[in-house]
């Protein structure tokens, strides 16, 4: 089906900075410290390979990865197919974020990643602490008041939360470009669905209470005949592909070794349990701490609060996939009418969840639109 896997790409063993410089792009690496002590690596590609001479301020574009992923998502293909490099070559100042718990954001001022306390977070905290800290840092560093925000998957989720609950942060976003947006997961066909059958009281028994390693939990739901072929076998044992789904047709299989070596990049069991709660409830709401008493301690109310995307006035452009198992078109259909400032929407009928970051035709289907929309914004 895929042919042989060639572990020939040097980026397999590289970090983000090395991956950027490997392709001849300038790179700056920073550490952003959140209010609650998490240390997040942030990378900057200040300009492209051919436009270093252009003086003056370049529009800032911030790229935020999705669930179980990292900033490498935006630079894992060849430069003409990777959104970060495409934007840099188009004359933009590109910044890549990392969410707490992933490979490049696994440090904290107060807690060791060996401790349970380090992993006591979900996407709530990514929205409440990680995004504001990173965006504030970028704004200060560039001296620009506003930036363009590109989110994929959970990167859109934390954007919806942050920009609807933090008005001063929302003012800093010129436009929100949402790829495979996820708010509710009521209709998801992803195998994340299967986690809803695990009772809350047994979730930590099965998965632990730190980093989420599904081990072989999902094997019981994977058809063995599908997963027995060499290439698919590699995908079937990878949590990112298991949860997001995969489709051979749009992949550049020569880059698969890069995808597999950098993903899954890690998240907490609590975050995966939050997603499981969202599947069960069909609602877009904060983490449920398991009892009215505990919820009161965190939220001053017995139930976790709902996130209200209608309160987000940031202009937003949305791309979703007709074959997306995680960001199901029905859920996207529920989301779109709630967005008060929707400026653009495109559904790509044959796209799945990961096609937005890795498909060979992503430039034609998505990225070129983003580049031209940002350049329109400049005028």
């Amino acid at each position: 089906l895929f042919g042989k896997l060639h572990p020939g790409s040097p980026e397999v063993t590289m970090n983000i900075s090395q991956m950027i410089t490997y392709w001849g792009y300038p790179n700056e690496e920073y550490e952003v410290v959140t209010e609650d002590g998490y240390i997040l690596e942030v990378n900057r590609i200040p300009y492209g390979k051919k436009n270093s001479g252009n003086t003056g301020q370049r529009p800032v574009v911030f790229l935020q990865h999705g669930l179980l992923a990292s900033a490498t998502n935006w630079i894992s293909n060849l430069p003409n197919n990777s959104l970060a490099f495409i934007l840099a070559d188009a004359g933009y100042d590109v910044w890549l974020g990392n969410s707490r718990g992933n490979t490049w954001a696994r440090r904290n001022l107060y807690y060791s990643p060996d401790s349970v306390e380090f992993w006591a977070f979900s996407f709530d905290e990514m929205a409440k602490y990680d995004l504001p800290a990173t965006i504030d840092f970028i704004v200060k560093k560039t001296g620009q008041k506003q930036l363009h925000y590109v989110g994929h998957s959970q990167g859109t989720t934390i954007g919806f939360i942050a920009f609807s609950t933090n008005p001063s942060l929302a003012k800093r976003i010129k436009t929100f470009y949402a790829l495979a947006p996820v708010a509710t997961v009521k209709y998801t066909k992803s195998l994340i669905n299967k986690l809803r059958f695990v009772p809350q009281s047994l979730f930590k028994f099965i998965f632990g209470d730190k980093i989420f390693y599904p081990h072989n939990f999902f094997d019981q739901f994977l058809a063995t005949e599908v997963c027995s072929r060499e290439m698919l076998n590699l995908l079937c044992s990878n949590a990112l592909f298991i949860i997001c789904g995969f489709d051979s047709k749009n992949f550049n299989t020569s880059r698969l070794d890069v995808y597999l070596s950098h993903n899954p990049a890690g998240t907490s069991v609590q975050n995966m349990f939050h997603w499981t709660q969202a599947v069960k409830s069909g609602k877009f709401q904060a983490y449920d701490w398991g009892s009215p008493v505990q919820n009161r301690m965190h939220y001053d109310q017995s139930q976790p609060p709902y996130y209200n995307v209608t309160a987000m006035n940031v202009p937003i452009a949305v791309w979703n996939g007709g074959k997306d198992l995680l960001a199901d078109p029905q859920d996207v259909g529920l989301l779109l009418p709630k967005l008060p400032n929707l400026i653009y929407h495109k559904e790509i009928p044959f796209y799945n969840h990961l096609d937005f970051i890795w498909a060979m035709d992503a430039p034609q289907e998505v990225y070129n639109d983003i580049v031209s929309m940002i350049s329109e914004d400049k005028k």
């Epitope: 401790s115 349970v116 009772p199 809350q200 009281s201 047994l202 930590k204 028994f205 632990g208 209470d209």
Partner: nanobody, 119 residues
Amino acid sequence: QVQLQESGGGLVQAGGSLRLSCTASGTTDNINAMGWYRQAPGKQRELVAAISSGGDTYYTEFVKGRFTISRDNAKKAVYLQMNNLKSEDTAVYSCKMTDMGRYGTSEWWGQGTQVTVSS
């Protein structure tokens, strides 16, 4: 220190039944969840079934409808009733118990008991 001891394994014909037992000894009064895992030759260890202190249960697809997990809190014991056994159920079955304290989870494993299903 907590020790877990399994018993009840053995050789059985396909379609037959076995009941596994696992008992904890030592100093623990706060066992939250208990469960059974298995490991077949040349394969990874996999979850079979689990039960919480409140009686919530989880079964993997492989065993649903055939196996039943239960526990006796007073005896600090967990049981696995296995019916309609198949040759693919052949494995070493180990029990696991956890104490989910405020500062994280302590977990204990048994040595395992061999279950062989002949066809």
